[in-house]
Interface confidence: low
């Protein structure tokens, strides 16, 4: 059977396409190529007479076509108007005509796209931003890249307008980008220059570094404050509530114990109008502080199960410490009946149950030291079984 094949099927505008013919019959008088899906003399491109090896252009001939003795047709410098069907009719020596139809698609060489934005300076958690990939072209696939990666699945990212528009709902500081759009068709692809968002945010709660709390007398105290912010935050320092200076770094040489106190960093963003502060305690001492052993006390050490409650108290004279509780090597609280209060100094169990019997201890700690109390044993007794009617005998 006579067939035709386009090489290539997808053609870039300005390139050439060869309409190859397969299974061409042996005994032929000639053949003709027509534009379209049927034989139409008004749309004949070229006719070829085998006996004379003469090619005759038809009404649809553009001067860019070349026919070969094997019936293949070369079309050069194709345009998008050349897209479509082409029909070959062969006139066999038995005068039986045979036809075959093929097709190809011409796509433009895509230009370098660009990104337009409705808001290039959005405010975090407030503004939405719509990016549009230009230009709008037919038969084009629009792809988006964020940080050189394809779009993540996110409810905050919406595509519309045939994927030509990317909308970021409620931008965050992590949405800075860069953003790129890519346009693709079967014969070409092109990517835009990257576009970044200047997301206004912050300041976040400042961080004071280094994290050290304890310093030796005679050392230099150099504190640096940083709060994530765009535009960058303006900083100021207070010591024990008294304003010191408007700098990001605070430097005090040759400190003494009198420099112990509360150091406050204040961060301000003039664009968002937001302020944040962080307070750091500085302790100037020669010693590497050692937390003393805490004392543990119980309101009672023998209780009645399902009836009594008990309070365990962890006592320490140390300051600047944290407290945690342990029961059978497990961290507490471990059930809804256990409550911590007064800065974790008190552990309350209400009501006490059989499984609460055992050894309890508390631990006090600061960033560089910790110590544990002696264990305390909680005994849980049960009275005689209650009466079925819920009343005591008597």
């Amino acid at each position: 059977q006579l067939t035709t094949e386009s090489m290539p099927f997808n053609v870039a505008e300005g390139k050439e396409v060869l309409l190859l013919v397969h299974n061409l019959p042996q005994q032929l008088f000639g053949y003709s190529w027509y534009k379209g899906e049927r034989v139409d003399g008004n749309r004949q491109i070229v006719g070829y007479a085998i006996g004379t090896q003469q090619a005759t252009p038809g009404p649809a001939n553009s001067g860019r076509e070349t026919i070969y003795p094997n019936a293949s047709l070369l079309i050069q410098n194709v345009t998008q108007n050349d897209t479509g069907f082409y029909t070959l009719q062969v006139i066999k020596s038995d005068l039986v005509n045979e036809e075959a139809t093929g097709q190809f698609h011409v796509y433009p060489e895509l230009p370098k796209p660009s990104i337009s934005s409705n808001n290039s300076n959005p405010v975090e958690d407030k503004d939405a931003v719509a990016f549009t990939c230009e230009p709008e072209t037919q038969d084009t696939t629009y792809l988006w890249w964020i940080n050189n990666q394809s779009l993540p699945v996110s409810p905050r990212l919406q595509l519309s307008n045939g994927n030509r528009t990317l909308t970021l709902l409620s931008v965050t500081r992590n949405d800075t980008g860069p953003y790129e759009c890519e346009i693709q068709n079967p014969v070409s692809a092109n990517r835009s220059d990257p576009v970044t968002l200047n997301v206004t945010y912050g300041p976040d709660t400042p961080t004071i570094s280094p994290s050290d709390t304890y310093y030796r007398p005679g050392a230099n105290l150099s504190l640096s404050c940083y709060a994530a912010s765009n535009p960058p935050a303006q900083y100021s320092w207070l010591i024990n509530g008294t304003f010191q200076q408007s700098t990001q770094e605070l430097f005090i040489p040759n400190i003494t114990v009198n420099n112990s106190g509360s150091y406050t960093c204040h961060a301000n963003n003039s664009v968002t109008g937001c302020n944040r502060t962080t307070v750091k305690t500085i302790i100037v001492t020669e010693l590497s502080p050692v937390v003393a052993k805490p004392q543990i006390k119980a309101s009672k050490t023998t209780v009645t199960g399902d009836k009594d409650s008990v309070n365990l108290t962890c006592s320490t004279n140390d300051t600047g410490i944290s407290i945690r509780w342990f029961f059978k090597n497990q961290s507490l609280p471990s059930s809804e009946r256990m409550k911590l209060s007064q800065g974790n100094t008190t552990l309350s169990i209400n009501p006490v149950k059989r499984e609460d019997a055992g050894t309890y201890w508390c631990e006090v700690f600061n960033p560089i030291s910790k110590n544990q109390s002696d264990p305390i044993m909680l005994n849980v007794n049960y009275n005689a079984l209650p009466q079925e009617n819920g009343l005591s005998p008597g």
Partner: antibody, heavy 121, light 111 residues
């Protein structure tokens, strides 16, 4: 090169006294907590005492409390161990050792070669 | 008796992997960093592992440390004859306010 060189060991009678020294070089001595660790003949290691880099914080093993005193002279890059009321069980090789963590995660990265203290009548 | 418990001896043939354990309590290993020391015969101890699992610079990666709860262990892979030594674990003890060592493990490389 970090070096710790102990000296002052020797034979002493029970109840007697001895002062060990540890000369440090190759590092900023005043930046490190220092310890004394001892090892009785054929036995394992036993920590004796630690002193903070500034000398203000000191701890002792229970076995030596009240008899041994640790001290340091940062201007001389030297660590000391004053040993009083010595007992036969104090017989050991005494090592000085450097703690690079200022005592916050105690470990001993450099040790001296040790000095032998023998308490015997 | 040592606060930290180690097996008194361990052995292996060259190329083998040997593990030395060290058991303590919440006041030492459980809440503080563990170090491992090697003492070759007639020499001062030498630090191998600190902060539970960090190798001191220059220590071969055949030595590795780990910790779980109140126990720690030192693993030596690709055992060599020069690894024959005494090995000690150590940690700060918050209750005693002092540094404690294990009793030491004598490692013998057989063959």
């Amino acid at each position: 090169e970090v070096q710790l060189l102990e000296s002052g060991g020797g034979l002493v009678q029970p109840g007697g006294s001895l002062r060990l020294s540890c000369a440090a070089s190759g590092f900023t001595f005043s930046n490190y907590a220092m310890s004394w660790v001892r090892q009785a003949p054929g036995k394992g290691l036993e920590w004796v005492s630690v002193i903070s880099h500034g000398g203000g914080s000191i701890y002792y093993a229970d076995s030596v409390k009240g008899r041994l005193t640790i001290s340091r002279d940062n201007s001389k890059n030297t660590l000391y161990l004053q040993m009083n009321s010595l007992r036969a069980e104090d017989t050991a090789v005494y090592y000085c050792a450097r703690d690079p963590t200022k005592g916050y995660a105690p470990t001993f990265d450099y040790w001296g070669q040790g000095t032998l203290v023998t308490v015997s009548s | 008796q040592s606060v930290l418990t180690q097996p008194p001896s361990a052995s292996g043939t060259p190329g083998q992997r040997v593990t030395i354990s060290c058991s303590g309590s919440s006041s030492n290993i459980g809440n503080n960093y563990v170090s491992w020391y090697q003492q070759l015969p007639g020499t001062a101890p030498k630090l191998l592992i600190y902060a539970d699992s960090k190798r001191l610079s220059g220590v071969p990666d055949r030595f590795s440390g780990s910790k779980s709860g109140t126990s720690a262990s030192l693993a030596i892979s690709g055992l060599r004859s020069e690894d024959e030594a005494d090995y000690y674990c150590g940690a700060w003890d918050g209750r005693l306010n002092g540094y404690v060592f294990g009793g030491g493990t004598k490692l013998t490389v057989l063959g």
